[in-house]
Amino acid sequence: TQHGIRLPLRSGLGGAPLGLRLPRETDEEPEEPGRRGSFVEMVDNLRGKSGQGYYVEMTVGSPPQTLNILVDTGSSNFAVGAAPHPFLHRYYQRQLSSTYRDLRKGVYVPYTQGKWEGELGTDLVSIPHGPNVTVRANIAAITESDKFFINGSNWEGILGLAYAEIARPDDSLEPFFDSLVKQTHVPNLFSLQLCGAGFPLNQSEVLASVGGSMIIGGIDHSLYTGSLWYTPIRREWYYEVIIVRVEINGQDLKMDCKEYNYDKSIVDSGTTNLRLPKKVFEAAVKSIKAASSTEKFPDGFWLGEQLVCWQAGTTPWNIFPVISLYLMGEVTNQSFRITILPQQYLRPVEDVATSQDDCYKFAISQSSTGTVMGAVIMEGFYVVFDRARKRIGFAVSACHVHDEFRTAAVEGPFVTLDMEDCGYNIPQTDESTLMT
């Protein structure tokens, strides 16, 4: 997945102000044993910092070596720093692990900007604030990298939670979550609640604060309000979904829905922004500009480069529109919509010159690889990656940032016809196709 513009976070000091949590609706699906309820030991197990990634604590090797690992649903390798690097406080020392096994194979992963490379092996892995299990998993020991690790981010590796099809060097390298499910009784699903703080955090605040939760093997009721709505996983590679309609403040963008998914739409916790295909981005920005026309913002702001600031506490949230994405539902001709606020798509940033003020960057950007529903989307919702049933669930997050007038929403059902036509079929480039 694209590095540079990838990687999320605002950590969760803020969340909903008191009195603004929504009441739980009662029309929920019946309980599924082992998959729902309370996962107290896993709640609040994520931390992070704006634009730098949500991470979970993991241990690797025997005796256990503790590392902070970026949670990334947009890739499929478990890869950790395994050599000294100026931005790493610690790294995996294979020679100190009695359970390390070398696979005698290298791996090279280039990004749009930057890369990492390393050596493949296996070792025992566990998640202290996760299920009480230890698994033998594939590990890429990163020996060399460029523009991959982030100074001050506090993570030393990456946990790719997507499917084997996009694993490097090829799909024969079993991803961590597949190994976990195969070797234990952990159900084949996980859920993420990423909590944006709504304001920038300094290093000490990040370390002391909560960034959200990764619930492995289940769904925790305390992390969301209302109902969970599910969209099918179109294909098991990335977590690919189908967007069938887009609205800005209730106004339909009126584009051929194929454009929304050109060449794919994915849910990716390792990307900061909501990234949209070029045509869709241009139409969306035009519509957002029109909706917020009481203020004129320079082009640099809409390109995500230019800071916009307001004196503390005066951000005019009301001039910015809500954005709704309609997703294919589980039932034929049925969709549902997820709605985010400017509190999600304006990303708080700190600048040395603006410490007394509230400053933001526009966190919707252009993509040449399809729609990426990054942290900007995920911070509004509790997201269930139900691999067992090949679907992704969305509910309003109990920690999303909002104001007294508007909240994020997940609503349905809506009648939408011919939704299958919204999916883009990427042309095959394998040898069999080339032969015809």
């Epitope: 913002f297 230019q306 600031c309 005066t314 005019p316 010159a353």
Partner: nanobody, 120 residues
Framework: QVQLQESGGGLVQAGGSLRLSCAAS????????MGWYRQVPGKQRELVAA???????NYADSVKGRFTISRDNAKNTVYLQMNSLKPEDTAVYYC??????????????WGKGTQVTVSS
């Protein structure tokens, strides 16, 4: 967009003086605050001095009594007169401006920086 163009940096001996200028151009609404910051490699950018359009200024403790910030509102330009320079003043000096578009909202702009080197 607003462009900030710094000038006046260079190499000077300890005890010497330099005058930095920063001219703003482009789509200017209300340059209420302008300032100078500096950065040495591996360290965070720090405030040197700042000034409002009304002329109120503030300084970092380390430069008080040696540096003077001023501005010409008609020319959208801010100046930094640096006297009694010390080797520890060596840094890249950046100009910044807050371009207010409403009572409390503004865009923050930075210049590209000008190198000041003080030799002992």
């Amino acid at each position: 967009q607003v462009q900030l163009q710094e000038s006046g940096g260079g190499l000077v001996q300890a005890g010497g003086s330099l005058r930095l200028s920063c001219a703003a151009s482009g789509r200017i609404f209300d340059l209420r605050d302008m300032g100078w910051y500096r950065q040495v490699p591996g360290k965070q950018r720090e405030l040197v001095a700042a000034i409002t359009s009304g002329g109120t200024s503030n300084y970092a403790d380390s430069v008080k009594g040696r540096f003077t910030i001023s501005r010409d509102n008609a020319k959208n330009t801010v100046y930094l007169q640096m006297n009694s320079l010390k080797p520890e003043d060596t840094a890249v000096y950046y100009c910044n401006a807050k371009n207010f578009f409403s009572a409390s909202g503004y865009f923050l702009y930075w210049g590209k920086g000008t190198q000041v080197t003080v030799s002992s």
